[in-house]
Interface confidence: medium
């Protein structure tokens, strides 16, 4: 059933054999195969791709490959009643209409079932009114409008540029400001890099290109109708009025050609400063309404999309572990795309496919990993991380007892400059050690390690000679595993140069122009960056599944806990008088962090010295490492966000994509000076310090000697 190799310290030649088997040419071939037609969640095309992947993973040699289906709430435009935005005159005549679709890229003119740009889960409606330009629609943008400029968005249609924060947060902010509709657009300042041509001649966004995307505020709930539980065949579903996270006002996305027509007529207040100006030849006036001659004209939205309960399919592949089959290392990425998915997600799915093929090759030669590896092709990620969340809800009892780690595998590239890693501190040392063993694909770093090029190009802001590793936020399928279940998680991809490229994401994100040719012509012609990402993701999975002692270093958690405690304390110290008045002290938190540091240090010493040939002691030590991430979970969750249960990290309340440290304390302190009841507000700060201090102390004690 197993070879001897599985029980020994990871033999270098096995890791080498696994890495050597990964081929750029295969990734290229798989990417091409996955991107020829759209694979929108809930469609027949995506079901067929699921079955194809199931069949191929079986051929590659996995022990079992199953489809896991769920019936979840999805959203689609009405095929006979298209969504659009108009400028109307005083008689109600439409004098300008936004485009109904993106001009298809060369070679794709005859492809059917390209979903037109829409904001998924927008309610239906035809609001009309004056326009207000709200910059990025961030919390601070609405503060500027409402508090400084005294501009009231109530009853207005707001227009916001994409970028900086998750679009769902923009819509939530607009709703809270009283807006009756939201128009989202891509400004060239954010989606057109200087000196680069627009697609098909380069990787920039053309004027007719539009970013699709969901506008939910799920806060980790998964399917809006079955929060906390799987959307299976006997599920009890909420009514649509009680559904989680749905927007209450119509929302629609447009490109910058159409945005120009709306913004060029804007009157009212001038932009407050240069940070509110994009790159269009318009004044970026805030409004409300149009200027002088056009003041009687209004904007009208026509939104007719429908929400429908639809079947989705995850593909779950298993490679059984030889020694610890009840310990799971998971590699997962999504399969559904908005259109062709050239980058998102298929650049990731192609890498997963090649990783599965390589593991399968080793298995056919008689090798097995020490621990079980699960491979997942998630569905409906674009509609709110639905496939991964429903599967995790269905399997939560197994996962919380057996889950060692989750490695995410969405887009492999968002640029071709250097590596980007976001992960739990437990994985820092694993990532450092692995990247030191891999070759850099970067020009000018021939013969150098990936670690070296990464550190040079993306240095840590705190630790000299080390690369930057960022916090996990959300907006991808690791969310349920990390934020809800407390399973150590990480993600890696190749990214752009953040110093010189200030645009948000990559310009063609979620547009029809995200094609195979975009990747093959402009981002990674040799697929060498894809191969490197495959080596990083695959190498992490290999080590996590095969090393005798789990490759987690708890001392790195101690370091960041101190950093995060310092940071949150410094934020609180903006209010020294209130700290004194309400007797707010961080002593308990700093004490808990100190205890964690000491206990982690002692645990690490014991880890070096224990008898690794004793399977009971080995399992005990590994379980302490595996369950450390779990120990940061508060079963009650964060205030008003029950599915975000990690006390150290949560998605920012102001930007789902970003991670926030000590989020309970951070949110309690946020804008505290504006709270109507300061005593209550500072009481909540104190409660959150107590929760954080207790959790850190409790986590520390899981690392103490067991008896």
């Amino acid at each position: 059933k197993s070879s001897n190799e599985a029980t020994n310290i990871t033999p270098k030649h096995n890791m080498k054999a696994f890495l050597d088997e990964l081929k750029a040419e295969n990734i290229k071939k798989f990417l091409y195969n996955f991107t020829q037609i759209p694979h929108l969640a809930g469609t027949e095309q995506n079901f067929q791709l699921a079955k194809q992947i199931q069949s191929q993973w079986k051929e590659f040699g996995l022990d079992s490959v199953e489809l896991a289906h769920y019936d979840v709430l999805l959203s689609y435009p009405n095929k006979t009643h298209p969504n659009y935005i108009s400028i109307i005159n005083e008689d109600g005549n439409e004098i300008f209409n936004t485009s109904l679709f993106e001009p298809p890229p060369p070679g794709y003119e005859n492809v059917s079932d390209i979903v037109p740009p829409f904001s998924a889960f927008s309610p239906q409606g035809m609001p009309e009114g004056d326009l207000v330009y709200v910059n990025y629609a961030r919390t601070e943008d609405f503060f500027k409008l409402e508090r400084d400029m005294k501009i009231n968005c109530s009853g207005k249609i707001v227009i916001a540029r994409y970028g900086k924060v998750f679009r769902g947060n923009k819509v939530k902010n607009a709703q809270l400001a009283g807006a009756k509709g939201v128009i989202l657009y891509s400004d060239p300042a954010d989606y057109f890099a200087p000196g680069v041509k627009s697609y098909p001649d380069g990787w920039n966004l053309p004027g007719g290109g539009v970013q699709r995307g969901n506008i939910l505020n799920l806060n980790g709930a998964g399917d809006p109708l079955t929060p906390g539980y799987p959307a299976n065949e006997y599920a009890y579903r909420r009514g649509i009025a009680e559904a989680v996270g749905l927007p209450s006002i119509p929302v629609h996305p447009i490109g910058y050609y159409d945005a120009q027509k709306l913004l060029e007529k804007m009157g009212g207040s001038a932009p407050p400063d240069s940070s509110w100006r994009g790159s269009l030849k318009v004044p970026y006036n805030v409004g409300p309404g149009f200027t002088g001659n056009f003041s009687t004209q209004k904007v009208k939205m026509h939104i007719h999309s429908t929400n429908e309960v639809t079947r989705i399919y995850n593909v779950i592949g298993t490679l059984r572990g030889a020694v610890e089959p009840d310990r799971y290392v998971i590699l997962g990425g999504h399969r559904d795309s908005w259109v062709f998915g050239g980058i998102d997600p298929q650049s990731g799915a192609a890498v997963v496919h090649e990783i599965v093929r390589s593991f399968g090759t080793l298995k056919k030669e008689g090798w097995r990993p020490r621990r079980t590896i699960l491979f997942a092709s998630w569905d409906a990620e674009e509609f709110g991380l639905l496939g991964s969340t429903e599967w995790a809800e269905e399997n939560s009892r197994l996962l919380q007892e057996r889950g060692v780690a989750y490695i995410n595998a969405d887009s492999s590239i968002e640029g071709n400059y250097t590596l980007r890693v976001d992960c739990t501190p437990l994985m820092y040392s694993l990532v450092h050690n692995l990247t030191k063993e891999l070759k850099s694909p970067d020009e000018g770093f021939e013969g150098k390690s990936l670690y070296e090029s990464w550190t040079k190009k993306s240095p840590s802001p705190e630790f000299s000679g080390m690369p930057r590793i960022s916090k996990l936020g959300s907006g991808n399928d690791f969310e349920v595993f990390f934020q809800r279940l407390g399973i150590a998680s990480g993600r890696a991809r190749y990214t752009k140069n953040w110093e010189t490229n200030k645009f948000s994401g990559y310009p063609l994100y979620h547009s029809v122009y995200e094609t195979y040719e975009l990747v093959e012509k402009f981002y990674d012609p040799m697929f060498k960056y894809h191969l490197t990402v495959a080596q990083v993701r695959g190498g992490m999975v290999f080590e996590l599944a095969n090393s005798i002692v789990l490759p987690f270093d708890c001392r790195d958690y101690a370091v960041v806990l101190r950093k995060y405690a310092d940071k949150i304390y410094s934020i609180s110290m903006k209010h020294p008088q209130e700290m004194k008045t309400y007797s707010v002290s961080f002593d308990s938190l700093f004490s808990a962090v100190k205890n964690f540091t000491e206990i982690a240090s002692k645990f690490s010493e014991r880890l070096q010295d224990f008898d690794k040939s004793n399977p009971i002691v080995l399992r005990m030590m590994n379980d302490q490492l595996m369950f450390l991430e779990r120990a940061f979970i508060d079963p009650l969750g964060l205030p008003d966000r029950p599915f975000y249960r990690h006390v150290i990290y949560a998605p920012s309340s102001h930007n789902k994509y970003a991670g926030e440290s000590f989020p309970g304390i951070y949110d309690a302190l946020f804008d505290i000076e504006s709270k109507v009841d300061p005593s209550k507000a500072w009481g909540e700060v104190k409660r959150q310090i107590y929760v954080a201090a207790f959790t850190v102390q409790a986590a520390a004690e899981t690392l103490s000697e067991v008896a």
Epitope: D273, P461, R468, S470, W498, S504, D566, S570, K574, G659
Partner: nanobody, 119 residues
Framework: QVQLQESGPGLVKPSQTLSLTCTVS??????????WSWIRQHPGKGLEWIGF???????HYNPSLKSRVIISVDTSKNQFSLKLSSVTAADTAVYYC???????????RGQGTLVTVSS
């Protein structure tokens, strides 16, 4: 858009104190989401982190430089400063000020200023 600009003498004598100021424009240094760093790059070498400061004075220094470094902030002028005492030729480098946070998009760096330590 936030911009950072370093200023200070380009030549410092050995054993003296190197003083640099970073002026932040287009955004407030008081934003609690960020910390403000000094970094240096020796000729032909990688970047070396010197230290960072929150606007309220909470500071972290690189342990290897801690005894010689003072970083301070002046929120009224939207500036933060670096003082490095007892300099030697080994402190010759391009000095950068930077804004940082925990997200990739937060990182911004000034143009840098070359400081030569020589008599």
């Amino acid at each position: 858009q936030v911009q950072l600009q370093e200023s200070g003498p380009g030549l410092v004598k050995p054993s003296q104190t190197l003083s640099l100021t970073c002026t932040v424009s287009g955004g407030s240094i008081s934003n609690s989401g960020y910390y403000w760093s000094w970094i240096r790059q020796h000729p032909g070498k990688g970047l070396e982190w010197i230290g960072f400061i929150y606007y309220n004075g909470s500071i972290h220094y690189n342990p290897s430089l801690k005894s010689r470094v003072i970083i301070s902030v002046d929120t009224s002028k939207n500036q933060f400063s670096l003082k490095l005492s007892s300099v030697t030729a080994a402190d010759t480098a391009v000095y950068y000020c930077a804004r940082d946070g925990d997200d990739y998009g937060d990182y911004l760096r000034g143009q840098g200023t070359l400081v030569t330590v020589s008599s």
